[in-house]
């Protein structure tokens, strides 16, 4: 017999989500208006295309990338969409309140939506570590806390360290990874006997996860270049990201084969390692002066990703209860750190090249920025984890982890689904 959504959650989720949606509508009604200045159509279309790329990355790319579980593929895709839709709404309001509110009303532009989509992407990266172990009501909490934490982090970094939009947002990799890992650490870990098969991957869902990886691979240059100010910066960012992800694909596939005793290629390694280069060059994608450097970074990132996928899952599964196929969290944490270190190296070179005695101070500022991102991620992640453990959310029982049947109505239940 199909397992039903627990009665209490059936009552609590619609009420909680719809009340929240009504509150958001009211906030939009009272505090926002559209940008009234007349922007020409060509400019609008170009600006919208960037936002569209980001939405495709979020909805299709990350949605399908997390859908490789044998019995949790529907939930992965749909819950991702739900979180994206909710996250974008809250991020638009929050960014507006934090940056424009003293002037009276929040002006919504296409750029606001672009920023909000990127903020919501953070949640989609983090949630990979907990998908299958939480219900939608809990995910709503996670969206609200993470988007709020990231928005505040960006504002603090912008005000204290005076960084631009791009540098500010590129902490997203490290932030999202550590947030997700700390939430996972708080959730019940052991899978009871008889449910181990559910967190295994299956061929068709793995194919859809590969489709997600392909979409992310195609649009990663748009993500890395979306917030840059000048055409030359965007051009360099697109080129360098493309070279880096191209090399990380080759590295991922060959490295995966190398890591296997029989030379076989692991789907899980490939899913995440193809993106490695894009994450590693993110912070400095517009600054890398020549293609070969971006390619070397892609190679190093691919190797780190495959190495991480081979040796870290055991530790992550034991300590954090993260299934073997959910490797985005620790992958992004390592690669995000690599990206930040590369930027610090560039900063040192810049300061040294200027014959400037203030290297230590500059490096200290950058490390401070990175540390702040990690600390806020860990603290807000732990807070979220503690909130998600509250009884009111009626979290799925451990026996119902990674199970679409808990959440979805299937017209017929085929054996073995």
């Amino acid at each position: 017999m199909s397992s039903k959504y627990p009665r209490s959650v059936r009552r609590c989720l619609p009420l909680w989500a719809l009340t929240l949606e009504a509150a958001l509508i009211l906030l939009f009604y009272f505090f926002t208006h559209y940008d009234a200045s007349l922007e020409d159509q060509k400019g609008l279309v170009a600006s919208y295309q960037v936002g569209q790329d980001l939405t495709v990355m979020a909805a299709i790319g990350l949605g399908f990338l997390t859908s490789s579980f044998r019995r949790h593929s529907w939930s992965s895709v749909a819950f991702n969409l739900f979180m994206l839709a909710l996250g974008v709404q809250w991020a638009i309001l929050l960014d507006g309140f934090l940056s424009q509110f003293p002037s009276g009303k929040v002006v919504i532009t296409l750029f606001s939506i672009r920023l909000a989509t990127m903020s919501a992407l953070s949640v989609l990266i983090s949630v990979d570590a907990v998908l299958g172990k939480v219900n939608l009501a809990q995910l709503v909490v996670m969206v609200l806390v993470e988007v709020t934490a990231l928005g505040n982090l960006r504002m603090v970094i912008s005000n204290i360290f005076n960084t631009d939009y791009h540098m500010n947002m590129m902490h997203i990799y490290v932030f999202a990874a550590y947030f997700g890992l700390s939430v996972a650490w708080c959730l019940p870990k052991p899978l009871p006997e008889g449910t181990e098969d559910k967190d295994q991957t299956a061929t068709i869902p793995s194919l859809s996860a590969m489709l997600g990886a392909l979409f992310l691979w195609m649009f990663w240059p748009s993500f890395n270049s979306a917030l840059l100010r000048s055409p030359i910066e965007r051009k360099n960012a697109v080129f360098n990201t493309y070279y880096a992800v191209a090399v990380s694909v080759v590295t991922a596939i060959s490295g995966s084969s190398l890591a296997h005793p029989q030379g076989k290629i692991s789907k899980t390694y490939v899913h995440s390692a193809v993106l490695a280069g894009g994450v590693a060059v993110g912070t400095s994608c517009h600054l890398i002066p020549s293609p070969w450097l971006a390619m070397v970074l892609g190679l190093v990132a691919g190797l780190i990703s495959v190495g991480g996928a081979k040796y870290l899952p055991g530790c992550c599964n034991r300590v954090l209860g993260i299934p073997h196929s959910s490797i985005m969290g620790y992958n992004f944490s390592l690669l995000g750190l690599l990206g930040e270190i590369i930027y610090i190296v560039l900063l040192v070179l810049d300061t040294v090249g200027a014959g400037n005695g203030m290297i230590g101070f500059q490096v200290l500022l950058s490390i401070g920025e990175l540390s702040l991102a990690i600390v806020i991620a860990l603290m807000s992640g732990l807070l979220t984890g503690l909130l998600l453990n509250l009884k009111i959310w009626k979290a799925p029982h451990e026996a119902k982890y990674f199970d679409d049947q808990v959440f979805w109505k299937f017209p017929h239940l085929a054996v073995g689904f």
């Epitope: 400019g43 600006s47 631009d164 910066e233 517009h286 600054l287 002066p289 810049d350 200027a354 203030m358």
Partner: antibody, heavy 125, light 106 residues
């Protein structure tokens, strides 16, 4: 030849409005960020506003935030500055300038490489 | 905040002139210099602390890093009598200009 030509200046009463235009020739506005910079009589240069090359971001000096709006029409290759609630402090020569970027090592260096001749705005009763 | 010294100076044709610009915090080499003649628009001279803009005579040079920068005119010409502004581009916006240094004929 790359050129910028401002127009629309004049005398306006306090609390009044004015729209300045800056026509660009020799390059496309859609591929360049643009600034407005002003200079009060006998004073130095003060940055007023910036619009990104794709029109996605507009930044303003604190002194004009909420009163001035920078915009552009790429089909006319023209930049605008809509000024509202003007006061005597806004009396100045207003210049438009092109935003240019060159890669440094740890960030880009931005500068204003092409300037218009300026248009004078006088706020007086 | 950007400060310039001196606020004005008098010099003769052929003199070597040095103008100093100080930033309130480390801006590495992200500094530009502009020249403005009376009644005219500003003109870019140097960007990135030391790179000469095309079309600018080689007698102009820029140096410095961190918080202290200098603009040097090796041999002052009659057309160089003007006001010179420095502008930081490390933390933008806002785009902060120095108060200017007026170079007058002695």
């Amino acid at each position: 030849q790359v050129k910028l030509l401002e127009s629309g200046g004049g005398v306006v009463q306090p609390g009044g409005s004015l729209r300045l235009s800056c026509e660009a020739s020799g390059f496309a506005l859609r591929s360049s960020g643009m600034h407005w910079v002003r200079q009060a009589p006998g004073k130095g240069l003060e940055w007023v506003a910036l619009i990104w090359f794709d029109g996605s971001i507009r930044s303003y000096a604190e002194s004009v935030k909420g009163r001035f709006t920078i915009s552009r029409d790429t089909s006319k290759n023209t930049l605008y500055l809509q000024m509202r609630s003007l006061s005597a402090d806004d009396t100045a020569v207003y210049y438009c300038a092109r935003d240019k970027a060159v890669r440094g090592i740890s960030r880009y260096n931005y500068y204003m490489d092409v300037w218009g001749k300026g248009t004078t705005v006088t706020v007086s009763s | 905040v950007m400060t310039q010294s001196p606020s004005s100076l008098s010099a003769s044709v052929g003199d070597r002139v040095t103008i100093t610009c100080r930033a309130s915090q480390n801006i590495i080499r992200y500094l530009n210099w502009y020249q403005q003649k009376p009644g005219k628009a500003p003109r870019l001279l140097i960007y990135g602390a030391s790179t000469l803009q095309s079309g600018v005579p080689s007698r102009f040079s820029g140096s410095g890093s961190g918080t202290d920068f200098t603009l040097t005119i090796s041999s002052l010409q009659p057309e160089d009598f003007a006001t010179y502004y420095c502008q930081q581009s490390y933390r933008t916006p806002p785009f902060t200009f120095g108060p200017g240094t007026k170079v007058e004929i002695k």
